[in-house]
């Protein structure tokens, strides 16, 4: 069964810009990836980007760019006001859902203010670093 991982990379010099990276490990056919967050813009879950293998990508503010980084992983870059970023990040959870065949939907989340690895599948330790 495939494992999903989530990671957040922040620019050391620019707190208003950061990126969410997520991917799936194992042998599976990816049919759709959805990246979302909770507690960032409002109380509910906000869809940041949807990436389809063939038809391309779609993103919504504050996501600025979404793209495939490898056949098994994606990246979503987010930009917002620096003060908003500082105050919001502490309470934000980023989630990535991979719809794969034959395994179905797999979700992993990264909660920025807790040390647990997230939901559903193991994720590596959080790695905050400069670009």
């Amino acid at each position: 069964s495939p494992e999903v991982w989530v990671q957040v990379q922040m620019e050391a010099t620019n707190l208003s810009s950061f990126s969410v990276h997520c991917g799936v490990l194992g042998y599976s056919l990816i049919s759709l990836v959805t990246v979302s967050c909770e507690g960032f813009v409002d109380a509910g879950r906000t869809k940041l980007a949807v990436l389809h293998p063939e038809f391309g990508t779609q993103q919504w503010a504050p996501a600025r760019q979404a793209h495939w980084e490898t056949p098994n992983s994606v990246s979503v870059t987010l930009t917002m006001g620096q003060s908003k970023a500082r105050s919001s990040l502490a309470n934000t959870t980023f989630c990535c859902e991979f719809v794969t065949f034959p395994h179905g939907s797999r979700v992993a989340c990264r909660d920025l203010h807790r040390s647990d690895p997230g939901l559903s599948a193991p994720t590596p330790a959080l790695n905050l670093q400069a670009d």
Partner: antibody
């Protein structure tokens, strides 16, 4: 222009391990996957596995699962491939290559490639 | 794993000939198919990606077509520097290479 430079040729005994390095220069390292491909003498190309340096996560071909470990060191922009329990059939040229793609779709391919590292397994 | 079968495994041709190499996937891979050229003692070189897109710097006599399970690499007019081994590669689920096709001088 990204370049991949691999470590030199190795001669190993059966049952031992070999670790081959692949140093990237001239581009971003962390957010491009590096794959390892081998080619036995007179044979075809075999994908062994690949790593995404930013997360440290690796995928492996089923054939090599449990015997190969691919790692990456972001500080030196270097990827490593370690193959254990070597046998004579592991004698091959080992290549590293960068997964390159369009970004907006899931199309990826290998470009550029390292120059190759010959690993000879002999008693 | 997805298996990639190339045919023929070798062929003899003359300069100026039209050469066609086929690659068949064991299951549908959409257009996730790349072609490489390899010369003895050298690393492979990318020719075609995404089934039909010509890599920058590759001569236009090379072309690729197909989708699903059946793919073709065509060299419209074989040149002396084209004698080499050609490999297809799927990138739909991880990666797998075909067995290769050696193009030799007749």
């Amino acid at each position: 222009q990204v370049q991949l430079v691999q470590s030199g040729a190795e001669v190993k005994k059966p049952g031992s391990s070999v670790k081959v390095s692949c140093k990237a220069s001239g581009g971003t390292f962390a957010t491009y996957a590096i794959s390892w491909v081998r080619q036995a003498p007179g044979q075809g190309l075999e994908w062994m596995g690949g790593i995404f340096p930013l997360s440290g996560t690796a995928n492996y071909a089923q054939k090599f699962q449990g015997r190969v470990t691919i790692t990456a060191d972001e500080s030196t922009s270097t990827a490593y491939m370690e193959l254990s329990s070597l046998r004579s059939e592991d004698t091959a040229v080992y290549y590293c290559a960068r997964d390159t793609g369009r970004g907006y779709t899931r199309h990826f391919w290998f470009d550029p490639w390292g120059q190759g590292t010959l690993v000879t397994v002999s008693s | 794993d997805i298996q990639m079968t190339q045919s023929p495994s070798s062929l003899s041709a003359s300069v100026g000939d039209r050469v066609t190499i086929t690659c068949r996937a064991s299951q549908s891979i959409s257009s996730y198919l790349n072609w490489y050229q390899q010369k003895p003692g050298k690393a492979p070189k990318l020719l075609i990606y995404a089934a039909s897109s010509l890599q920058s710097g590759v001569p236009s006599r090379f072309s690729g077509s197909g989708s699903g399970t059946d793919f073709t690499l065509t060299i419209s007019s074989l040149q002396p520097e084209d004698f080499a081994t050609y490999y297809c590669q799927q990138s739909d689920i991880l990666y797998t290479f075909g067995g290769g096709t050696k193009v030799e001088i007749k």
